[in-house]
Interface confidence: low
C-alpha cells in the first residue's frame, strides 16, 4: 500500500511550547483509514479518518515535541479482504524546527 504524504500545517510552532499540527494524507481514495503518527520510531498519536476523507490532522499539544527526538512519520492502515488489516509504507520524514532565540 503506498505511503501517505505528510506536512506541517499552519500555524507553525515558534517554540517548543507551541502546538504542532501535522497533516497526513493517503494518496488514493482510501475511506476511513486509521492513521498513526510516529516520532523517533515511537507512536505519538492515533486517528481515524472520517469515511469521506482520506486524511487526518494530528494536533499535538505544546511540549510534546521535546521527547522522543527525531523526525515525524505517519502511516495508515486499511481493511482488506476478510477484514485483515494492511499497513501502508511509512511516509517521508518531516522535521520540526524552531527559530533560534535572539537573546
Amino acid at each position: 500500500i503506498p505511503a501517505p504524504s505528510i506536512r506541517l500545517v499552519p500555524p507553525y510552532p515558534s517554540s517548543q511550547e507551541d502546538p504542532i499540527h501535522i497533516a497526513c494524507m493517503a494518496p488514493g481514495n482510501f475511506p476511513g483509514a486509521n492513521f498513526t503518527l510516529y516520532r523517533g520510531g515511537q507512536v505519538v498519536q492515533l486517528l481515524q479518518a472520517p469515511t469521506d476523507q482520506r486524511g487526518v490532522t494530528f494536533n499535538l499539544s505544546g511540549g510534546s515535541s521535546k521527547a522522543p527526538g527525531g523526525p515525524f512519520h505517519c502511516q495508515y492502515g486499511v481493511l482488506g479482504e476478510l477484514n485483515q488489516s494492511q499497513l501502508s509504507d511509512l511516509s517521508e520524514p518531516v522535521n520540526v524546527s524552531f527559530p533560534v532565540p535572539t537573546w
Epitope: 500500500i1 488514493g28 469515511t51 481493511l79 482488506g80 479482504e81
Partner: antibody, heavy 124, light 107 residues
Framework: QVQLVESGGGVVQPGRSLRVSCAVS????????MHWVRQAPGGGLEWVAV????????HYADSVKGRFTISRDNSKNTLFLQMDSLRAEDTAVYYC?????????????????WGQGTLVTVSS | EIVMTQSPATLSLSPGERATLSCRAS??????LAWYQQKPGQAPRLLIY???NRATGIPARFSGSGSGTDFTLTISSLEPEDFAVYYC?????????FGGGTKVDIK
C-alpha cells in the same frame, strides 16, 4: 459470467419515492463494493453512491445526499437504491456497477462491470 | 469536487486512423484515472484504469498515459467497433467524477 441486472425504474411524480434494484450473478457479491451511477438523457455520467462489500461504508454525491439511500442484501445478491423526494433533475438511466477491488486496500472507484441500466423519469 | 474536462468534444476520424483523446483534471489525481467506452444504448465499459492499465479483455490498440492533471487515451488504429463515446473518471477523491465525454465518430 458476471451479470448485473437493474429493475424498478419507471415514471414517478416529483416529491414521490422509488426503489430500484440490481440483481447480480457470476461473482461473489458479498466480496465487492458496489456503486450507482446515473446518466441523464443525452448527457454524461454522474456518480451517485457507493457501498462497501460488507455494508459498513456508504458515500453519496452531494446532489442526492439526504434523499437517496444505498443498501444491499448479500444473502440475495441484490443492491438497492431508495430514492425519496424525487426531482425532475433526477430523471436518468440508473446503472449499478461493481467496484474492481475486493475491499479497501486498492481504494475505491474502478468500475469494472456495469448493468444495462433502468430508466427513472420524474415528471408530473 | 474535482472537475474533469475532456477534449475534443467530438473527434471525426476514419477506420485505421490514430485517435488521441485528452482529459484534464482541475487538480492532481495522481494516476487514479480510468477510461470508459460507451456505445449507444449500452452501458459503459471499463477500458483503462489507474491511467495506463488495460482492463481484462481490452485490445492492445487501447493505451492510456499521463499523471497528475493531464491524461491521454490513444487508440492506435481505429476499428469500426471503436466509434463510441469515451469518458474519463477520477477516483482520487470523493465524489468520483467523470469528464463530459469525447465522441469518436466516422468521418
Amino acid at each position: 459470467q458476471v451479470q448485473l441486472v437493474e429493475s424498478g425504474g419507471g415514471v414517478v411524480q416529483p416529491g414521490r419515492s422509488l426503489r430500484v434494484s440490481c440483481a447480480v450473478s457470476g461473482f461473489t457479491f458479498s466480496s465487492y463494493g458496489m456503486h450507482w451511477v446515473r446518466q441523464a438523457p443525452g448527457g454524461g455520467l454522474e456518480w451517485v453512491a457507493v457501498m462497501s462489500y460488507e455494508g459498513s461504508f456508504r458515500h453519496y454525491a452531494d446532489s442526492v445526499k439526504g434523499r437517496f439511500t444505498i443498501s444491499r442484501d448479500n444473502s440475495k445478491n441484490t443492491l438497492f437504491l431508495q430514492m425519496d423526494s424525487l426531482r425532475a433533475e433526477d430523471t436518468a438511466v440508473y446503472y449499478c456497477a461493481r467496484d474492481r477491488p475486493a475491499g479497501y486496500t486498492s481504494g475505491w472507484g474502478i468500475l469494472d462491470y456495469w448493468g444495462q441500466g433502468t430508466l427513472v423519469t420524474v415528471s408530473s | 469536487e474535482i472537475v474533469m474536462t475532456q477534449s475534443p468534444a467530438t473527434l471525426s476520424l476514419s477506420p485505421g486512423e490514430r485517435a488521441t483523446l485528452s482529459c484534464r483534471a482541475s487538480q492532481s489525481v495522481s494516476s487514479y484515472l480510468a477510461w470508459y467506452q460507451q456505445k449507444p444504448g449500452q452501458a459503459p465499459r471499463l477500458l483503462i484504469y489507474d491511467a495506463s492499465n488495460r482492463a481484462t479483455g481490452i485490445p492492445a490498440r487501447f493505451s492510456g498515459s499521463g499523471s497528475g492533471t493531464d491524461f491521454t487515451l490513444t487508440i492506435s488504429s481505429l476499428e469500426p467497433e471503436d466509434f463510441a463515446v469515451y469518458y474519463c473518471q477520477q477516483r482520487s477523491n470523493w465524489p468520483l467524477t467523470f469528464g463530459g465525454g469525447t465522441k469518436v465518430d466516422i468521418k
